[in-house]
């Protein structure tokens, strides 16, 4: 007899066939915290920009992705130092001069305010109450971020 | 009254919450490959190094990590042109003066036999046929992964 | 406990080395970016170089480039820093200091040893 | 190089008053700034980073304001241990990290 588990195996897949939806997550893996439809990992050790964003592509996660102002407070909120930075998913793209998500979508400028230059070799790290450009090199903390509800249609095409 | 889908929501938190187990892929999303216990995904598209793993980790996937030689020849079988080179997630750390997997772990030199030089800005490819180091600005295909199974407390502690 | 402690100091005469370590202990070396701090006899202080937890970066203070060299060696908890062609005015107690973690190259000085002095004398 | 000027660079005060120390910076550091104390013979100890948030462990008599050139250091009731010397220090992201001149709190 088949486990509720497994059960739900073919349950999920018949939906995904119907809908091209892939299992989402359901809720967020122990140690993350949820907010909104994100899970989100800050990391308590330091490393480069590059590195971080290994760490959470090995976790089969992102550097986080901020979509709006409301959002980057939300996050904010959740860190406890003011002088604390973690790393995002938001670097200087030298060949598009311009700001660039690790999602392939620009800035829209009017979301974050930046202090700092915007420059080759230039990443991007939240503080308690601000938003920084740094070098890349430089070694701090990171958030990794993991979509918590299944989307539909999701079906990952190259970016 | 739930449909099966909130039901296996139910199911797999309280099967999380007893084993600390994440709610992991059942299945493999529409247009991944299954190769044993992993999903892969091989782009269409081009990218350097950098952006390849950018995308996987937008994708809440890894670069593809390579465990020994048989996993290697069963990926490299899934290549249908001998002549396509694919990223994998193994670049040269030039601190360490070695070849490194995303995940932080060192390559075994018996694992994979790799043409070319270990030296900075050095990224590893896969063929049909061969291993090869290259320029990790170089643009070419690349391959993600997700881990198909649930593992028993993946817990995701920094690296 | 949480500690730094300097030892290679002493006198040299001008032109000569020195090599000055710093032993950590009681908190997570590897995750810190580490510097050494100076300060003359009746002076102020002055920073002289820092090196980023993983050795990657590292800077100096204009006044010692080219004849001073900070290490680290993660594994030993330790700090180094080689001091060459020395001159009257390296004279000073040197400190090791600790930045608060994570504030990337904004290096705030949380932690301190109690200094080491250098003399260089004919 | 952002060059930090204290003022005064010596004060005489008594148990009980309230102290106020100011450093300006040749050009703005938004808020990077700490201020350190420091006793004869002792090390350097860190009250105030980020130019307001108060150090673990540090009374709270002690407080930190401003942002981009001009900054404070308050001290509201003078204690008989805060005699010292306090320096305040820039910590932009771009080395050299250059320290105040100083200033020398005396007893009156």
């Known amino acids: 007899q088949k486990s509720s588990i497994e059960k739900c195996s073919v349950d999920i897949q018949q939906s995904r066939n119907k809908t091209t939806e892939r299992p989402g997550l359901l809720n967020c893996p122990i140690y993350w915290q949820q907010l909104r439809e994100k899970c989100l990992l800050f990391s308590h050790t330091v490393n480069p920009w590059n590195n971080s964003l290994a760490d959470c592509s090995t976790k089969e996660s992102s550097l986080l992705l901020i979509r709006d102002k409301d959002e980057l407070i939300h996050t904010q909120n959740l860190i406890r130092d003011k002088a604390i930075l973690f790393w995002i998913g938001l670097n200087f793209s030298l060949s598009e001069k311009n700001w660039k998500w690790i999602n392939g979508s620009f800035l829209n400028s009017n979301d974050l305010e930046i202090r700092g230059d915007a420059k080759e070799n230039s990443c991007i790290s939240i503080s308690q109450t601000s938003v920084y450009s740094e070098y890349c090199s430089t070694e701090i903390r990171w958030i990794c971020q993991k979509e918590l509800t299944p989307v539909r249609n999701k079906v990952y095409p190259d970016s | 009254q739930k449909s099966s889908i909130e039901k296996c929501s139910v199911d797999i938190q309280q099967s999380r919450n007893k084993t600390t187990e994440r709610p992991g892929l059942l299945n493999c999303p529409i247009y991944w490959q299954q190769l044993r216990e992993k999903c892969l995904l091989f782009s269409h598209t081009v990218n350097p190094w950098n952006n390849s793993l950018a995308d996987c980790s937008t994708k809440e996937s890894s670069l593809l990590l390579i465990r020994d030689k048989d996993e290697l020849i069963h990926t490299q079988n899934l290549i249908r042109d001998k002549a396509i080179l694919f990223w994998i997630g193994l670049n040269f750390s030039l601190s360490e003066k070695n070849w490194k997997w995303i995940n932080g772990s060192f390559l075994n030199s018996n694992d994979l036999e790799i043409r070319g030089d270990a030296k900075e800005n050095s990224c590893i490819s896969i063929s049909q046929t061969s291993v090869y180091s290259e320029y990790c600005s170089t643009e070419i295909r690349w391959i993600c992964q997700k881990e198909l199974t649930p593992v028993r407390n993946k817990v995701y502690p920094d690296s | 406990q949480v500690q730094l402690v300097e030892s290679g100091g002493g006198l040299v005469k001008p032109g000569g080395s020195l090599r000055l370590s710093c032993a950590a202990s009681g908190f997570t070396f590897p995750q810190y970016y580490m510097s050494w701090i100076r300060q003359a006899p009746g002076k102020g202080l002055e920073w002289v170089s820092y090196?980023?937890?993983?050795?990657?970066?590292?800077y100096y203070a204009d006044s010692v480039k080219g004849r001073f060299t900070i290490s680290r060696d993660n594994a030993k908890n330790s700090l180094y820093l080689q001091m060459n062609s020395l001159r009257a005015e390296d004279t000073a107690v040197y400190y090791c200091a600790r930045s608060l973690m994570s504030t990337g190259t904004h290096l705030y000085f949380d932690l301190w040893g109690r200094g080491t002095l250098v003399t260089v004398s004919s | 190089d952002i060059q930090l000027t204290q003022s005064p660079s010596s004060v005489s005060a008594s148990v009980g008053d309230r102290v106020t120390i100011t450093c300006r910076a040749s050009?703005?550091?938004?808020?990077?700034l700490a201020w350190y104390q420091q006793k004869p013979g002792k090390a350097p100890k860190l009250l105030i980073y980020a130019a307001s948030s108060l150090q673990s462990g540090v009374p709270s008599r002690f407080s930190g304001s401003g942002s981009g050139t001009d900054f404070t250091l308050t001290i509201s009731s003078l204690q008989p241990e805060d005699f010292a010397t306090y320096y305040c220090q820039q910590v932009t992201s771009t080395p050299p990290y250059t320290f105040g001149g100083g200033t020398k709190v005396e007893i009156k």
């Open positions: 090196i980023s937890p993983s050795g990657a970066t590292i």
């Open positions: 050009q703005g550091i938004s808020s990077w």
